[in-house]
């Protein structure tokens, strides 16, 4: 049994920011889960992670230097990405793993969302280089 994920085929980030909504064929209420957003055809870069827990606030983080936030709906997680660079235009895939209660469930690979970053050409500062390769 796999969870199905729906994403917009394409989004344009005009001000270096975008909301990407991942809609699941599964109700996340009272579940413990790990939702993540991955960049590239091979999903090589984990852009943002949202840990959902029945009793605690959402934990949202990026280990790859992206500025991200997350918002939870009953059957969706929305990733809010800011300070995107033009060279981060790419395809982005939503992923979900529901861990508790068992059984473990994850998703069929979605079609992804092409995020086209059209914003101002942000230059990475020397102290904080861009988080991913062009």
């Amino acid at each position: 049994n796999k969870i199905l994920v729906k994403q917009s085929p394409m989004l344009v980030a005009y001000d270096n920011a975008v909301n990407l909504s991942c809609k699941y064929s599964y109700n996340l209420f009272s579940r413990e889960f790990r939702a993540s957003l991955h960049k590239g055809l091979d999903s090589a870069v984990e852009v943002c992670v949202v840990y959902g827990n029945y009793s605690q606030q959402l934990q949202v983080y990026s280990k790859t230097g992206f500025n991200c936030d997350g918002k939870l709906g009953n059957e969706s997680v929305t990733f809010y990405l800011q300070n995107l660079y033009v060279n981060q235009t790419d395809i982005y895939f939503c992923k979900i793993e529901v861990m508790y209660p068992p059984p473990y469930l994850d998703n069929e690979k979605s079609n992804g969302t092409i995020i086209h970053v059209k914003g101002k050409h942000l230059c990475p500062s020397p102290l904080f280089p861009g988080p991913s390769k062009p």
Partner: antibody, heavy 120, light 111 residues
Framework: EVQLVESGGGLVQPGGSLRLSCAAS??????????VSWIRQAPGKGLEWIGS???????YYNPSLKSRVTISRDNSKNTLYLQLNSLRAEDTAVYYC????????????WGQGTLVTVSS | DIQLTQSPSSLSASVGDRVTITCRAS??????????LHWYQQKPGKAPKLLIY???SLQSGVPSRFSGSGSGTDFTLTISSLQPEDFATYYC?????????FGQGTKVEIK
């Protein structure tokens, strides 16, 4: 035949770190359907879950240890690792790795355990 | 966290006795009709061994004298006729929520 073999235990100084290994055979750590957890047992005490890793590489930790623990794996060696930092006397325990299936998360196979003693 | 309380903490019994151990959870561990409560046996110096999973399913290779029952918050492990090799400590465990937790154990000793 499924087998789990822990290694790396021994005497560690307070404040130090430990890195334990769990070599798996008879199944692949990266195959969907099974995961592995670390569980410990202080001398004469009960069992305490440390954390789990899934076939995807995703991890879950016991909040009481989360700030000090990392579970990782090397798929090429089919081996699981436990890193525990800032060790204290209360971390003295036998450390077990145990496999679970995704249906119920019951631990169906266990290693023999490795003893870690934290003492100066 | 879900607390699991086993009773009794220890018991003395003779070979052939019927032994019952209970495990009470601080909240329900049921989900869609399944109970995420498991039982293990541990002998001194050895790793625990899975006996019963999902409250009442006998793990492969475990003798049929072991049985489990219960749902929600109250669970029971029964040994219908105690054998010499059954003297050990028994633990319940829940896998409904993180952190996964174990009962404090019940030691079954020879009378």
């Amino acid at each position: 035949e499924v087998q789990l073999v822990e290694s790396g235990g021994g005497l560690v100084q307070p404040g130090g770190s430990l890195r334990l290994s769990c070599a798996a055979s008879g199944f692949s750590l990266s195959t969907s359907g099974v995961g592995v957890s670390w569980i410990r047992q202080a001398p004469g005490k009960g069992l305490e879950w440390i954390g789990s890793i899934y076939h995807s590489g995703s991890t879950y930790y016991n909040p009481s240890l989360k700030s000090r623990v990392t579970i990782s794996r090397d798929n090429s060696k089919n081996t699981l690792y436990l890193q525990l930092n800032s060790l204290r006397a209360e971390d003295t325990a036998v450390y077990y790795c145990a496999r679970y299936e995704y249906g119920y998360y019951a631990f169906d196979y266990w290693g023999q355990g490795t003893l870690v003693t934290v003492s100066s | 966290d879900i607390q699991l309380t086993q009773s009794p903490s220890s018991l003395s019994a003779s070979v052939g006795d019927r032994v019952t151990i209970t495990c009470r959870a601080s909240q329900s561990v049921d989900f869609y009709g399944k109970s995420f409560l498991h039982w293990y046996q541990q002998k001194p110096g050895k790793a625990p061994k899975l006996l019963i999973y999902a409250a009442s399913s006998l793990q492969s290779g475990v003798p049929s004298r072991f049985s489990g029952s219960g749902s929600g918050t109250d669970f029971t492990l029964t040994i219908s006729s105690l054998q010499p090799e059954d003297f050990a400590t028994y633990y319940c465990q829940q896998s409904y929520r993180t952190p996964l937790t174990f009962g404090q154990g019940t030691k079954v000793e020879i009378k």
